[in-house]
């Protein structure tokens, strides 16, 4: 796997341990927590990143669930089970044998149960809505400039194919970025929208996963964009299955 050869680090994932023990003395990097080899030329999967994060725990921040089918990561951090490809396993359990089903971004999509709970497949999150509120600026951002800057960001920083950025909406002070990626659209080597959204979320929170970088500070035509709050909504190809009690709570 590629990494910075000179000092053997992983540019796309600072939560790794790297050493020149790959084939021919090449730099190889393994994710903290799981020990899995990662490809440093692209984003690391969210599952491996969460696992690495749990090896150095921090306080979880939580978001708000706005509607019946849109999921938000209300449960915060947990130590996930990842498959050999680094994807979330459909069923996740904690150390007290409480289990639940998750989607492809690792967000719980069923009520919690016991070890008998079955999760037949990993349901894909095909639509992600990133909702940002920015602080007052010198004036409203020009919509097309904002659109271009955010598309550039996802293309260059997160290596997400432009076709997966479905839309950028703007009604001052709210910015919405829509990411869409169906199972059939995602080719081998394509960055997953869930991974791109997670890197973006961590960047906005000033916890960049990239090696040697601080948080992400955006500017549009020179104008500083200071984010006041971020909410991320996840929509799955199959609607989540929660009891009526949860839906009316």
């Amino acid at each position: 796997h590629t990494a910075a050869q000179d000092n053997c680090t992983c540019p796309t994932n600072k939560m790794t341990v790297c050493s020149p023990d790959g084939p021919g003395g090449r730099c190889q990097c393994r994710a903290l927590g799981s020990g899995m080899a990662v490809d440093c030329s692209t984003l690391t999967s969210k599952c491996l990143l969460l696992k690495a994060r749990m090896s150095a725990p921090k306080n979880a921040r939580t978001l708000v669930r706005p509607s019946e089918h849109a999921l938000v990561d209300n449960d915060g951090l947990y130590d996930p089970d990842c498959d050999p490809e680094g994807r979330f396993k459909a069923r996740q359990c904690n150390q007290t044998s409480v289990c639940w089903c998750v989607n492809s971004v690792g967000v719980r999509r069923t009520d919690k149960g016991d070890l008998s709970l079955r999760c037949d497949e990993l349901v894909r999150t095909h639509h992600i809505l990133i909702d940002l509120r920015h602080r007052p600026t010198a004036g409203a951002f020009n919509h097309s400039d904002l659109d271009a800057e955010l598309r550039r960001l996802f293309r260059e920083r997160y290596r997400l194919h432009p076709k997966f950025v479905a839309a950028v909406h703007y009604e001052q002070p709210t910015i919405q970025i829509e990411l869409r990626q169906n199972t059939s659209q995602k080719a081998a080597g394509d960055v997953d929208i869930g991974d791109a959204a997670y890197y973006f979320e961590r960047d906005i929170k000033g916890e960049s996963l990239f090696q040697g970088r601080g948080g992400l500070d955006l500017r549009v035509r020179g104008e500083p964009l200071q984010v006041e709050r971020t909410l991320i909504y996840y929509l799955d190809e199959i609607p989540p299955k929660f009891s009526m009690k949860r839906l009316t709570a």
Epitope: A138, K205, G206, S208, G215, G222, E223, P224, Q226
Partner: antibody
Framework: QVQLVQSGAEVKKPGASVKVSCKAS????????IHWVRQAPGQRLEWMGY????????KYNEKFKGKATLTSDKSSTTAYMEVRGLTSEDSAVYYC????????????WGQGTLVTVSS | DIQMTQSPSSLSASVGDRVTITCKAS??????LAWYQQKPGKAPKLLLY???SLETGVPSRFSGSGSGTDYTLTISSLQPEDFATYYC????????FGQGTKVEIK
């Protein structure tokens, strides 16, 4: 290399106005805002506001709204800060500064302009 | 407005000492914190941004840490040219500075 060069020291009477200039060079002027920061003797640095030379949009610290006016001139790549109704409290060093290329911290600063208000 | 409180306001140290300055924000600033060094009659100089990222050309004896509301600047081995005043600055919600910490020769 990036440079911000400010106008010289000024001595003003109470009630007067002062206009400080900041000439930018070594980068594309419209790519970054220009911040203005004030430092009164023995005091902390105080952000006054910024101007975006791209569209002349301004954002001010509430404390300086109506007190300071920020302008810029693209043709001469110069930013200006005018303070009106000067009092002894406005005696300070005034700095212009440019943001860091990847954050909103300030990495290039002018040399500062000392404004003294005295009767 | 976000308030930034630095401590101590001044300290005396010798060359070779390890020096630690702390900065507390009145609310979470999500690592949007910069540290500056200022010498008498000079403009501030950016040392670190993003709480931990060292500005190009700044010696590695300077380091930053912290998260949430609490941040620290550490000078691992004080050098003669490090005697100055240090300011923290948040840039999460507009821009505000700490009151400064003067590092003097013991």
């Amino acid at each position: 290399q990036v440079q911000l060069v400010q106008s010289g020291a000024e001595v003003k009477k109470p009630g007067a106005s002062v206009k400080v200039s900041c000439k930018a060079s070594g980068y594309t002027f419209t790519t970054y805002v220009i911040h203005w920061v004030r430092q009164a003797p023995g005091q902390r640095l105080e952000w006054m506001g910024y101007i975006n030379p791209n569209n002349d949009g301004t954002k001010y610290n509430e404390k300086f709204k109506g007190k300071a006016t920020l302008t810029s001139d693209k043709s001469s790549t110069t930013a200006y800060m005018e303070v009106r109704g000067l009092t002894s409290e406005d005696s300070a060093v005034y700095y212009c500064a440019r943001p860091h290329f990847e954050t909103h911290a300030m990495d290039y600063w002018g040399q500062g302009t000392l404004v003294t208000v005295s009767s | 407005d976000i308030q930034m409180t630095q401590s101590p306001s001044s300290l005396s140290a010798s060359v070779g000492d390890r020096v630690t300055i702390t900065c507390k924000a009145s609310e979470d600033i999500f690592n949007r914190l910069a540290w500056y060094q200022q010498k008498p009659g000079k403009a501030p100089k950016l040392l670190l941004y993003g709480a931990t990222s060292l500005e190009t050309g700044v010696p590695s004896r300077f380091s930053g840490s912290g998260s949430g509301t609490d941040y620290t600047l550490t000078i691992s081995s004080l050098q003669p040219e490090d005697f100055a005043t240090y300011y923290c600055q948040q840039y999460w919600n507009t821009w505000t500075f700490g009151q400064g910490t003067k590092v003097e020769i013991k």
